[in-house]
């Protein structure tokens, strides 16, 4: 969210997406109400080819990296304001995500649903 | 790794102005930038934050409205552009690079050497 | 806002001493607390992050410590290079608030 002012409170802020290729498309920003949430990054790369980077807030958030046959997940989980800003870059064209989307349905989701 | 910031002068109240700061010796695009200030009584407060793309801004309440941070990466600049300058903005003007220890964690690791605003009639 | 409380603005010391400096903190904020030096120049420097973490080319003499709302930066064996006003800073939450300020003096 661009211009984004403060507003009181202590919900922790983070960036918030689902499924992009760049950190540039992930610029929504989260208020994460409930208490003990964290900001969490996933980042899915299919066989080489391609990053996907989804973001937000997760209540059970906890580091991991696992392989897949199609690919490898990393999360990444942090407790600041605006902590999950980075992710990796993506190097290839968004049409090549839609023909890769079904094989890493699974994957591209939150941690609470991984 | 430097950064250099110009652009400060004496301006009338009301009067609006931009800073800018040179960025030299590292990837500028890579790092989120903010401006800092401090004012006469030699207290430090942020007034603006911005991610690596230039994408995403951040203000405190006490400077919303007023402040515009930017940033131009393929000349390695950062902006700030002040309007409706009042008399409590009076300060000497830092920018910085955050840079990020951990998943969670991250300081402010370089700062340029400051340009003086002075706002008076 | 959380408020960033170093009671003591300035402080007077002699070489060779041994000086703390102390920050509070209106809430708890996890260690993400950093400490600044800027010189009478006005020139500022990193010198702690993460509470305790020296900052590439700061001298062992800077130490940190603290944690949930008390931190404390520690010189030992103070220099001449030394004299500076030093600032804490937090990382938690927005919008990141600095400490006043303390001034060290030489007696």
């Known amino acids: 969210m661009a211009g984004l002012a403060l507003q009181p409170g202590t919900a922790l802020l983070c960036y918030s997406c689902k499924a992009q290729v760049s950190n540039e498309d992930c610029l929504q920003v989260e208020n994460c109400t409930q208490l003990g949430e964290q900001c969490w990054t996933a980042r899915i790369r299919a066989v080489g080819l391609l990053t996907v980077i989804s973001k937000g807030c997760s209540l059970n958030c906890v580091d991991d990296s696992q392989d897949y046959y199609v690919g490898k997940k990393n999360i990444t989980c942090c407790d600041t304001d605006l902590c999950n800003a980075s992710g990796a870059h993506a190097l290839q064209p968004a049409a090549a995500i839609l023909a890769l989307l079904p094989a890493l349905g699974l994957l591209l989701w939150g941690p609470g649903q991984l | 790794v430097q950064l250099q910031e110009s652009g400060g002068v004496l301006v009338q109240p009301g009067g609006s102005l931009k800073l800018s700061c040179a960025a030299s010796?590292?990837?500028?695009?890579?790092?989120?930038m903010s401006w800092i200030r401090q004012t006469p009584d030699r207290r430090l407060e942020w007034v603006a934050y911005?991610?690596?793309?230039?994408?995403?801004?951040f203000y405190p309440d006490t400077v919303k409205g007023r402040f515009s941070i930017s940033r131009d990466n393929a000349k390695n600049t950062l902006y700030l552009q002040i309007s409706r300058l009042r008399s409590g903005d009076t300060a000497i003007y830092y920018c910085?690079?955050?840079?990020?220890?951990?998943?969670?964690?991250?300081?402010?690791?370089?700062w340029g050497a400051g340009t003086t605003v002075t706002v008076s009639s | 806002d959380i408020v960033m409380t170093q009671s003591t603005s300035s402080l007077s010391a002699s070489l060779g001493d041994r000086v703390t400096i102390n920050c509070g903190t209106s809430?708890?904020?996890?260690?993400?607390l950093n400490w600044y030096q800027q010189k009478p120049d006005g020139s500022v420097k990193l010198l702690i992050y993460?509470?305790?973490r020296l900052h590439s080319g700061v001298p062992s003499r800077f130490s940190g410590s603290g944690s949930g709302t008390d931190y404390s930066l520690t010189i030992s064996n103070l220099e001449q290079g030394d004299i500076a006003t030093y600032f804490c800073?937090?990382?938690?939450?927005?919008?990141?608030?600095f400490g006043g300020g303390t001034k060290l003096e030489l007696k």
């Open positions: 910085s690079r955050r840079m990020y220890y951990g998943n969670s964690h991250w300081h402010f690791d370089v």
């Open positions: 809430q708890d904020i996890n260690n993400y």
């Open positions: 911005i991610n690596d793309s230039g994408g995403s801004t």
């Open positions: 993460y509470t305790s």
């Open positions: 010796g590292f990837t500028f695009s890579s790092y989120s």
């Open positions: 800073q937090q990382s938690k939450t927005l919008p990141w608030t």
